[in-house]
């Protein structure tokens, strides 16, 4: 029953977890306008991984994609890339997990297979987890040298008669749900990891041992016993737990055109 | 066609308060912010503050907070201004002022302060 | 808050001129974030609501003559009529789009001579 928790929770858990990866990769606030030399901007930037936005006065927020490969710092490229990678492994992961639920039954798969599957995916998640945990990490870093960099140079030009700041970008919300994200499926495929454990037959089963009673032929031969799971192989009358395995949709919500500075 | 359809010309004597509207059409409301602006008479414009149609957010030229009160009824497509404390400075045109660029401007309300 | 400043206050011409007035900011109004100026010019005449000309410094309007245009970049920008028209005797405001409070300029009166 534990394992079949374990394995449920891992799953939920890692299903979240990967819908905050998608809409981390989706959306426009990876990096927002450091508001600290102007908190009374009219024109308000962010960008985000595929294109950057500008909301002006007007309430109007016009956004343009990069509509170019080679000419994106290698940096971003790098972040994109393991984001993908992370929702591409996730996804399998989410696959093949389905699969190995322990509440869901599939034909006369062997509970070795499941056991197989569920750490295969509990691999996918962790790995998954880790790329956009890298990816998040990699972009805030990289704003963080741009931050301190547009500072050293903040008032240039004109020597120094005309005011010109330059705009600086600093941590914006897809950072923290990338980060939540990552954590969640990470920890989901630690979680399947350890219910794979559970699920794995252990290699020496019990002999059959014959038992005589005085006054009685009798023999009991109990079937092999898997440690832990609490049923014997020869264990007819399993529980199958329809619906056990629940899809959580998390609403990732964007921030709107019309929330303003 | 968008357009802007402010209320009439208003006479008042020092201290009262006056509430204007700005009807809009032609546009979904809750698109653009919608910003005031007044003209004193011969004078350059001065912009007063503007709100958000969609969350009712506002955001005031530091000049008139305390003056004026922006506010929206997002079923009749409706912004409203109150202006309390009247003087005699405050004699002007308040224009309300919305769409890209600040582009579509109403015809603009007359407010007279005369005791 | 930004300052806006026009030069001349106003002008006499006479129709077929080419004009030129400035408007110069106490700070930039140049956005790196989409490489614009906000920066925007409105016409007015009298008893009227002001008319948007150009929006990020030099953009036209749709539907406002081509004889109109606007240059300039950071804190210095000029509106230029290439050809004044009887219909163009009116009052020219420039305007920061960029910070709150959005401010205009005194406004350049152009007249007939």
């Known amino acids: 029953m534990a394992v079949t928790a374990c394995q449920g929770l891992g799953f939920v858990v890692s299903l979240i977890g990967i819908a905050g990866i998608i809409a981390a990769t989706c959306m426009d606030q990876w990096s927002t306008q450091d508001l600290y030399n102007n908190p009374v901007t009219a024109v308000f930037n962010y960008q985000g991984l595929w294109r950057s936005c500008v909301r002006e006065s007007s309430g109007f927020t016009e956004c343009r994609g990069y509509f170019t490969l080679l000419g994106l710092p290698a940096m971003l490229q790098a972040v994109r890339a393991l984001m993908i990678v992370g929702i591409v492994l996730g996804a399998i992961g989410l696959l093949v997990s389905i699969f190995a639920l322990k509440c869901i039954r599939i034909g006369s798969m062997e509970d070795s297979a499941k056991a197989n599957m569920t750490l295969t995916s509990g691999i996918m998640f962790i790995v998954s987890g880790l790329c956009a945990i890298a990816g998040v990490s990699v972009f805030a870093n990289m704003l963080v040298t741009n931050f301190w960099m547009s500072t050293a140079n903040m008032y240039t030009g004109m020597g120094g008669m005309v005011q010109t700041v330059q705009t600086r970008y600093t941590f914006g919300a897809a950072l923290f749900v990338g980060w939540v994200a990552g954590g969640l499926t990470l920890i989901g495929g630690v979680m399947m990891c350890i219910a794979c454990r559970g699920l794995a037959p252990e290699e020496t089963n019990y002999k059959a041992v014959s038992y005589h009673a005085s006054g009685h032929s009798v023999a009991y031969k109990p079937g092999g016993f898997k440690a832990s799971t609490g049923f014997g192989s020869n264990t007819k009358n399993k529980k199958i737990y329809d619906g056990g395995a629940r899809t959580e949709d998390e609403v990732q919500s964007y921030p709107s055109k019309h929330d303003y500075v | 066609e968008v357009q802007l359809v402010q209320s009439g010309a208003e006479v008042k004597k020092p201290g009262a308060s006056v509430k204007m509207s700005c009807k809009a059409s032609?546009?979904?409301?809750?698109?653009?912010?919608m910003h005031w602006v007044r003209q004193a008479p011969g004078k350059s414009l001065e912009w007063i503050g503007y709100?958000?149609?969609?969350?009712?957010?506002?955001s005031y030229n530091q000049k008139f907070k305390g003056k004026a009160t922006l506010t929206v009824n997002k079923s009749s497509s409706t912004a409203y201004m109150e202006l309390s404390s009247l003087r005699s400075e405050d004699t002007a045109v308040y224009y309300c002022?919305?769409?890209?660029?600040?582009?579509?401007w109403g015809q603009g309300t007359t407010v007279t302060v005369s005791s | 808050d930004i300052v806006m400043t026009q030069s001349p206050s106003s002008l006499s011409v006479s129709v077929g001129d080419r004009v030129t007035m400035t408007c110069k900011s106490s700070?930039?109004?140049?956005?790196?974030?989409?490489?614009?100026?906000?920066l925007t010019w409105y016409q007015q005449k009298p008893g009227k609501a002001p008319k948007l000309l150009i929006y990020?410094?030099?953009t036209r309007e749709s539907g406002v003559p081509d004889r109109f245009s606007g240059s300039g970049s950071g804190t210095d920008f000029t509106l230029t009529i290439s050809s004044v028209q009887p219909e163009d005797f009116a009052t020219y405001f420039c305007?920061?789009?960029?910070?709150?409070?959005?401010?205009f300029g005194g406004g350049t009166k152009l007249e007939i001579k």
């Open positions: 990020w410094a030099s």
């Open positions: 700070q930039s109004l140049f956005n790196s974030g989409n490489q614009k100026n906000y």
């Open positions: 305007q920061n789009d960029y910070s709150y409070p959005l401010t």
């Open positions: 002022v919305t769409t890209r660029y600040l582009a579509v």
């Open positions: 032609g546009y979904t409301f809750t698109d653009y912010n």
């Open positions: 709100i958000n149609p969609n969350n009712g957010g506002t």
